[in-house]
Amino acid sequence: KSSNEATNITPKHNMKAFLDELKAENIKKFLYNFTQIPHLAGTEQNFQLAKQIQSQWKEFGLDSVELAHYDVLLSYPNKTHPNYISIINEDGNEIFNTSLFEPPPPGYENVSDIVPPFSAFSPQGMPEGDLVYVNYARTEDFFKLERDMKINCSGKIVIARYGKVFRGNKVKNAQLAGAKGVILYSDPADYFAPGVKSYPDGWNLPGGGVQRGNILNLNGAGDPLTPGYPANEYAYRRGIAEAVGLPSIPVHPIGYYDAQKLLEKMGGSAPPDSSWRGSLKVPYNVGPGFTGNFSTQKVKMHIHSTNEVTRIYNVIGTLRGAVEPDRYVILGGHRDSWVFGGIDPQSGAAVVHEIVRSFGTLKKEGWRPRRTILFASWDAEEFGLLGSTEWAEENSRLLQERGVAYINADSSIEGNYTLRVDCTPLMYSLVHNLTKELKSPDEGFEGKSLYESWTKKSPSPEFSGMPRISKLGSGNDFEVFFQRLGIASGRARYTKNWETNKFSGYPLYHSVYETYELVEKFYDPMFKYHLTVAQVRGGMVFELANSIVLPFDCRDYAVVLRKYADKIYSISMKHPQEMKTYSVSFDSLFSAVKNFTEIASKFSERLQDFDKSNPIVLRMMNDQLMFLERAFIDPLGLPDRPFYRHVIYAPSSHNKYAGESFPGIYDALFDIESKVDPSKAWGEVKRQIYVAAFTVQAAAETLSEVA
């Protein structure tokens, strides 16, 4: 069967028909609809939105749309006992308290159920003590404090600015340093772009705005009480003491008005260098404690949030494939938001909705994709990627045998400057080819391709004339599919100019001010960037589901493997004495990469030449392509991170958002000079080189001729 037997539309026309059906005005309408009230995970409002999406996807023409529910651990503030931070005097009197809520934006003053700013999964507690300012609370910040400045955080409350790394890593680092509480705040240096007004007059963060977010260190586990298995009706749940990834010290977020009040009194050591100074009019002294006149004052945290097992709902829509219904291409993004979700996630959910509508329109005209497309509206992403992970755990046997690709669809925009893509190397050529066929929405690039504007604005650091494509890290719903199951994955969105805007993320991220109006007034009034992202995401799904030969190029994996091997070798060679002493050799890894390169090249030649009309041979070649990503999975996982199983990529151990290449070797080498037993440490480096070399060689062999 050819992929066109189920339709009277030619393949080229299919893609054109699909893309032409996508409309900016619809995305705008859907975004408005999804952002009028909060849709916090575990709430009735978010359940109602799940049912609405289920109903609309059915109307759009999908074959089936089901709700998949799970009972997972979530976290909420206590409605009658609010969280806050105080400065207390020597008598214990509270002489300053942080705000209990964000001032609501215009037009939303009467909206109920706006969850106040909190750090999800913080334990309860009322610690009091001296403050230590720890910059971004990165690994290197604590090294600077402890090793260079000899400042001890043990028994202190630390205050850290948001940005640079995932907030859960900040909390983990503070715990390891012995802190008894963490205050997170948004510094204007990171969340207030110069020359732009605060919301509602611009897209900057006002002083009362606060970033919510979870502070877990799940390392891919999903629901903290049911790691590895779905949180279904008959689940066995761990006790809270054995739960995965929960923080052990109280944590709370504040805005920069409140942060000013805490930081202006700081004494102790001066900041070590200018990289520790933000933009507030405070000295950015590290502490510990307050300066002279205020030295008897302390900081006290009041945290009363509770962890509760709560029902969540994914929406799973199916468009059955005409030729290979047992091959799944998945488009998924989350639905739950911290408050209104103007950008995160509803700018993504609105795009998914329009993509479903377009596919549904084609299906109603008699068309079907070659392969099955699954659409997902995930719940509880903000609480640790819970909905996607539980569903993947429940369906892991199907996914590992049938999963072709996963395309993520969270926020469509984090700026309006250029495209940003993170994906498996297998998808590089797909992304390049697709963006060459799409029109750029950028001013000054009228009549030019998206590829051209993207390449001009975000050039590859290695290859001239090509755009930058980044490694997948984590912090979003592709994690379980890529890092645990080894399903080829990708994500695309419009982003800011990273060179001129050094703030972290976008200023209003996870605040009450992330509204429909923020997008419609300031980011994308014409919704042209949303439309472009819909075309990229939808186009990728279309090609993955419909092309006769899967649009994966294994030669691009060979190129990056060589680059990553070069990089990790260079890191290791910074310890030449130990390399020599312990006979640490990268020969096996370079040899495996060489073999992979040669075998991938031969496979690509066979892919050009084979008889595509022979369905058995076609399926065989496609299976080799589909299973290549799977071949990089080590069933034993990474050390102490069993759900991160991809040997080539993992979220950085120091920043969940960032991807690290050859993570096993990288982590074994990290700070190796401080290890108490160098022989054991370098033995682990050698073991990790062995695991990586074996995995690359084994993956190469999956591309060899089968007999």
């Epitope: 070069d566 060679m573 390399m579 050799s585 020969d587 370079f590």
Partner: nanobody
Amino acid sequence: EVQLLESGGGLVQPGGSLRLSCAASGFSFSSYALSWVRQAPGKGLEWVSSIGENNHTTDYADTVKGRFTISRDNSKNTLYLQMNSLRVEDTAVYYCVKDGVHWGQGTLVTVSS
């Protein structure tokens, strides 16, 4: 059998330049990243620079950044280290290294007035 043969060392005045070469044989040269490592008299080994498969992928120790340039010619199976603005503290035996375990015999660079 892997062989790495360094050359180009010698005596040079501070501020002067030298170009070291490392001729390689016995392995698929272009398939390996390579490094320069040095050992100053009475000191331990110190990494200087590494290079990947092409001249884009390079890395340098802070002590030599901006003064030294590593490069390779895959057609000639040769690794190079161009050393400019040499300092007294650059005096050392310079080794070419493949994969971490295969080392050349080294070439002596002496920077002295």
